[in-house]
């Protein structure tokens, strides 16, 4: 969490951003909140990016003002206009690209004063893994697949019964470049699995951590997966 204050002494307002990650090829959100004002017409929101000459987005007098917008963001940005009055200056970014990563500044002016806060925006690819029993294999084998990751993640297997066990000797992980030549498909195979046990396939890079669980019993197979972004630090 980054909390910024205005520089002009008592005429300063608190602006808060949260470092976040964008999944390339999806819409992303850059979070920013501020002390609200009573009048929408008195609020100015400016989003800037380090190293970019034009503005990322500007919202003033209750509407978008895009005349100074940088070409790389044209047609891609929006604030949540109906939420500005309650102090939400978050930015929606359409079709996140790797090149959108960087340091952004959320700069706010209201009748109470000015304030700003920086935000580190990371971009990459992350997806939910799916773990299945590989019936084609000669021995009891599990196959963990996740369609899109970038940068290249690490894959670690764990089991409920053998907690702390190292499965690197009985697993094999491969990374297959997807057609757009950036993201990769992750496939990890775990051999010699035992029945009545829960196995977890954990995929992690510096942006996200995802886990796929599978419980295999003689009568059924239960699956569960979840994904968590790692760098949500507020500023």
């Amino acid at each position: 969490l980054i909390i910024g204050f205005g520089i002009s002494g008592r005429h300063s307002i608190t602006v808060t951003t949260v470092a976040s990650a964008g999944n390339i090829g999806e819409d992303g959100i850059l979070s920013c909140t501020f002390e609200p004002d009573i009048k929408l017409s008195d609020i100015v929101i400016q989003w800037l990016k380090e190293g970019v000459l034009g503005l990322v987005h500007e919202f003033k007098e209750g509407k978008d003002e895009l005349s100074e917008q940088d070409e790389m963001f044209r047609g891609r940005t929006a604030v949540f206009a109906d939420q500005v009055i309650v102090g939400n200056a978050s930015l929606r970014l359409k079709n996140v690209q790797l090149t959108d990563a960087g340091t952004y500044k959320c700069y706010i002016i209201t009748s109470k004063g000015k304030g700003n806060a920086n935000l580190e925006y990371k971009t990459g690819a992350f997806s939910m893994p799916e773990v299945n029993v590989d019936y084609n294999a000669s021995s009891e084998t599990l196959r963990c697949e996740a369609p899109r990751w970038f940068p290249q993640p690490t894959v670690v297997w764990a089991s409920q019964v053998d907690q702390g066990a190292n499965f690197s000797e009985v697993s094999n992980t491969s990374f297959e470049l997807n057609s757009e030549n950036v993201t990769m498909k992750v496939v990890s195979v775990l051999y010699n699995v035992t029945i009545n046990n829960t196995y977890s396939c954990m995929i992690e890079n510096d942006i996200a951590k995802a886990t796929g669980d599978i419980k295999v019993t003689e009568s059924e197979i239960k699956r569960r997966s979840h994904l968590q972004l790692l760098n949500s630090k507020a500023s």
């Epitope: 978008d64 891609r76 206009a81």
Partner: antibody
Framework: QVQLVESGGVLVKPGGSLRLSCAAS????????MSWIRQAPGMGLEWVSY????????YYTDSVKGRFTISRDSAKNSLYLQMNSLRAEDTAVYYC?????????WGQGTLVTVSS | EIVLTQSPGTLSLFPGERATLSCRAS???????LAWYQQKPGQSPRLLIY???SRATGIPDRFSGSGSGTDFTLTISRLEPEDFAVYYC??????????FGQGTKLEIK
């Protein structure tokens, strides 16, 4: 140059199925949001379905949810629309369109007629 | 659900005149996500304006877009014979994800 070519539109009976294809050239499909948009005879444009660049996010307009499925094959650089349980009101020219900043490229359209 | 209402439904003008087409949204739309299209009979739509006011590649400068929030305008400063067509506005990002206006038919008087 950028080109989108739809195919697969025919006359089909109510309740029937159809698969539309859209072959893209001059750009990589998976770099862009892609949509299917339709236009009933003499009517306006209606957005039908969307797939994100990543392929992870898919949306449909309410009237086709549960009946239509959008997909793509990155290796073939093609977009598809599987249409099941077709109704008379699905009769339209179906366009695939690339969303760069707005729908900057459209196919020529393929006519789907649902009639008994 | 966001609704885009275009007016007038039909606009009859002479070549050389100025055309002003309106698109009103039922709730606020980001200027970044508002586009205008032209469609001629038997043809696919063509992108004219994106981000409310930016001309698409190859579009003559007699076409201009303006507006923000809920009110957007497409202006054709001096009508050419090839400009008579149907015009649609379109938004992205609300529910449903994409919405088109019902269209304005621009016809020769």
């Amino acid at each position: 140059q950028v080109q989108l070519v739809e195919s697969g539109g025919v006359l089909v009976k109510p309740g029937g199925s159809l698969r539309l294809s859209c072959a893209a050239s001059g750009f990589t499909l998976s770099d862009y949001y892609m949509s299917w948009i339709r236009q009933a005879p003499g009517m306006g444009l209606e957005w039908v379905s969307y797939i994100s660049s990543s392929g992870s996010t898919i949306y449909y307009t309410d009237s086709v949810k549960g009946r239509f499925t959008i997909s793509r094959d990155s290796a073939k650089n093609s977009l598809y629309l599987q249409m099941n349980s077709l109704r008379a009101e699905d009769t339209a020219v179906y366009y695939c369109a690339r969303d760069g900043v707005g729908f900057d490229y459209w196919g020529q359209g393929t006519l789907v007629t649902v009639s008994s | 659900e966001i609704v885009l209402t275009q007016s007038p439904g039909t606009l009859s003008l002479f070549p050389g005149e100025r055309a002003t087409l309106s698109c009103r949204a039922s709730q606020s739309v980001s200027s970044s996500y508002l586009a205008w299209y032209q469609q001629k009979p038997g043809q696919s739509p063509r992108l004219l304006i994106y981000a409310a006011s930016s001309r698409a590649t190859g579009i003559p400068d007699r076409f201009s877009g303006s507006g923000s929030g809920t009110d957007f305008t497409l202006t054709i400063s001096r009508l050419e014979p090839e400009d008579f067509a149907v015009y649609y506005c379109q938004q992205y990002g609300s529910s449903p994800l994409y919405t088109f206006g019902q269209g304005t038919k621009l016809e020769i008087k």
